[in-house]
Interface confidence: medium
């Protein structure tokens, strides 16, 4: 903390500006009225501020504002938010896209940082769910935002807001973290016809179930390997051959490639061998031809 | 719960076969939801899958032990087996039948039975 | 076939200490990743699943993160019982591969 000390005759701060860089700490301190900084946050973002002195205006700030700062004063903070702890942004109530795009402005291209991810969490707390316009802005910002979040975070994002997502920002969803948003964007994809419906669907399949695998490969869809890749296990299991085979298209010859895999390795376990021979790719590891399968067994396999 | 238990001799020659059961209790073999492997591990080394066989007598087994492994599945006798053909010293190791569950973690496994492969 | 790389392959601690064992994949395996504890002239156990699911029955004192190719095993605080042998096992391509082990001493 800096030490009290009054401030030099003729020095008193009448406005934020350059003249300040070459003020001490300590007369910065003493100098510079709290209130006057306040209302003029703005302007400290231009100034070349050392970091040392944007210790002593957070100090001056967190002085005139102990139980957190208004967000007139937030929304300005600029560089200074690079010095606010997570404890700070607690105290805040930020309640502005603006605001919030502003502050992410400050961190762009870097990691989230503690500090952004509690704006974040608070700002999204503060409106009760993750709307369309946040998970624009947030997406935009951080591409992986999305599958940072937990299902239980997720199950608050209404099903408009899936409009925002774009392929990019599943790379990193686990499948529990698909299993919550598939249901929303299939709902939000639901008016759209077949092969527009696939393109927007096909970045969620990863929380698809079986019956919905199986109505696509009705469809002509021509799923990609990559995409097949990352469906459920589960979901895949119950599939036929012909059913896959339909659901890939052209593409079934890349699961020779993948045959080691899951979950095509799990699948191929459960396909009989003369099934998997009129596909004419070589795969091996089937049921054995002539071997008798139990329904009950295969019924288990499934549930 | 689900135990698995090897049995099978301890000591085999050189150039001979290799054969070990894994008797299952308290589960049936015959679920659709495991895979059933068999695993080794040298004295004082890390862990080798062998390979893997499924209900309905799919196998999956490890490429560089291929030519020489047989794993079946006797679903009346809840058991699965191993054969090992045409062994070395290299093959000496404590060999662990397992569960592998649909998660793909082998969620049970025997206590290990050690066999060596000496003249 | 993918390769299991674990680090370090042994370490020193006490009790009551935060220890972090790391797995590197050669290659994507998604989550398929799972950790298991061998104690000498035992079976391993199932401690982690699928990258950060814990198996039940086990302390939750074990953590477990990661995807793609680079995991972590966390003990956050380290108990007698734990001291140890601990291996990574990628479940996502077969051959089924272990990472080499990581055995933890008694400082």
């Known amino acids: 903390e800096v030490e009290k000390t009054a401030c030099p005759s003729g020095k008193k701060a009448r406005e934020i500006d350059e003249s300040l860089i070459f003020y001490k700490k300590w007369e910065l301190e003493a100098c510079v009225d709290a209130a006057l900084l306040a209302t003029q946050m703005d302007r400290v973002n231009a100034i070349p501020f050392t970091y040392e002195q944007l210790d002593v205006l957070k100090h001056k700030l967190d002085e005139l504002y102990p139980q957190g700062y208004p967000e007139s004063v937030i929304q300005h903070l600029g560089y200074l938010f690079l010095k606010m702890s997570p404890e700070d942004i607690r105290k805040w109530n930020v309640t502005s896209l603006e605001t919030l795009k502003a502050l992410l402005e400050v961190n762009k291209g870097h990691e989230m940082s503690p500090q952004v991810a509690t704006l974040i969490d608070r700002f999204v707390k503060g409106r009760g769910q993750l709307d369309k316009d946040t998970l624009d802005t947030l997406t935009a910002f951080y591409p992986g935002y999305l599958c940072s979040l937990s299902p239980e975070e997720l199950s608050s994002v209404p099903p408009s807001s899936i409009w925002a997502v774009r392929p990019q920002d599943l790379d990193t969803c686990d499948p529990r973290q698909l299993d919550v948003l598939y249901p929303k964007a299939r709902l939000a994809f639901q008016n759209m016809n077949g092969s527009e419906y696939f393109v927007k669907i096909q970045s969620f399949l990863g929380g698809a179930p079986t019956e919905d695998l199986k109505a696509l490969s009705q469809q002509n869809v021509s799923m990609d390997l990559a995409t097949f890749m990352k469906l459920r296990t589960d979901a895949v299991l119950p599939l036929t051959v012909a059913e896959v085979q339909k659901l890939l298209g052209p593409h079934v010859e890349g699961l020779k490639a993948e045959e080691r895999h899951r979950p095509v390795r799990d699948w191929i376990l459960r396909q009989r061998q003369d099934d998997l021979d009129t596909l004419g790719l070589g795969l091996q590891g089937g049921i054995p031809n002539g071997y008798l399968v139990l329904d009950l067994s295969m019924q288990e396999a499934l549930s | 719960q689900v135990q698995l238990q090897e049995s099978g001799p301890g000591l085999v020659k050189p150039s001979e076969t290799l054969s070990l059961t894994c008797t299952v209790s308290g589960g049936s073999v015959s679920s659709g939801s495991y895979y059933w492997s068999w695993i080794r591990q040298p004295p004082g080394k890390g862990l080798e899958w062998i390979g893997y066989?499924?209900?309905?007598?799919?196998?999956n087994y490890n490429p560089s032990l291929k030519s020489r492994v047989t794993i079946s599945v006797d679903t009346s006798k809840n058991q699965f087996s191993l054969k090992l053909s045409s062994v070395t010293a290299a093959d000496t190791a404590v060999y662990y039948c397992?569960?592998?569950?649909?998660?793909?973690?082998?969620?049970?496994w025997g206590q290990g039975t050690m066999v060596t492969v000496s003249s | 076939d993918i390769q299991m790389t674990q680090s370090p392959s042994s370490l020193s601690a006490s009790v009551g200490d935060r220890v972090t064992i790391t797995c590197r994949a050669s290659?994507?395996?998604?989550?398929?990743l799972n950790w298991y504890q061998q104690k000498p002239g035992k079976a391993p156990k199932l401690l982690i699943y699928?990258?950060?699911s814990l198996q039940s029955g086990v302390p939750s004192g074990f953590s477990g993160s990661g995807s793609g190719t680079d995991f972590t095993l966390t003990i956050s605080s380290l108990q007698p019982e734990d001291f140890a042998t601990y291996y990574c096992q990628q479940s996502y391509s077969t051959p089924l591969t272990f990472g080499g082990g990581t055995k933890v001493e008694i400082k």
């Open positions: 699928a990258a950060s």
């Open positions: 290659q994507s395996i998604s989550s398929y």
């Open positions: 066989i499924y209900y309905s007598g799919s196998t």
């Open positions: 397992a569960r592998e569950g649909k998660n793909g973690a082998f969620d049970i």
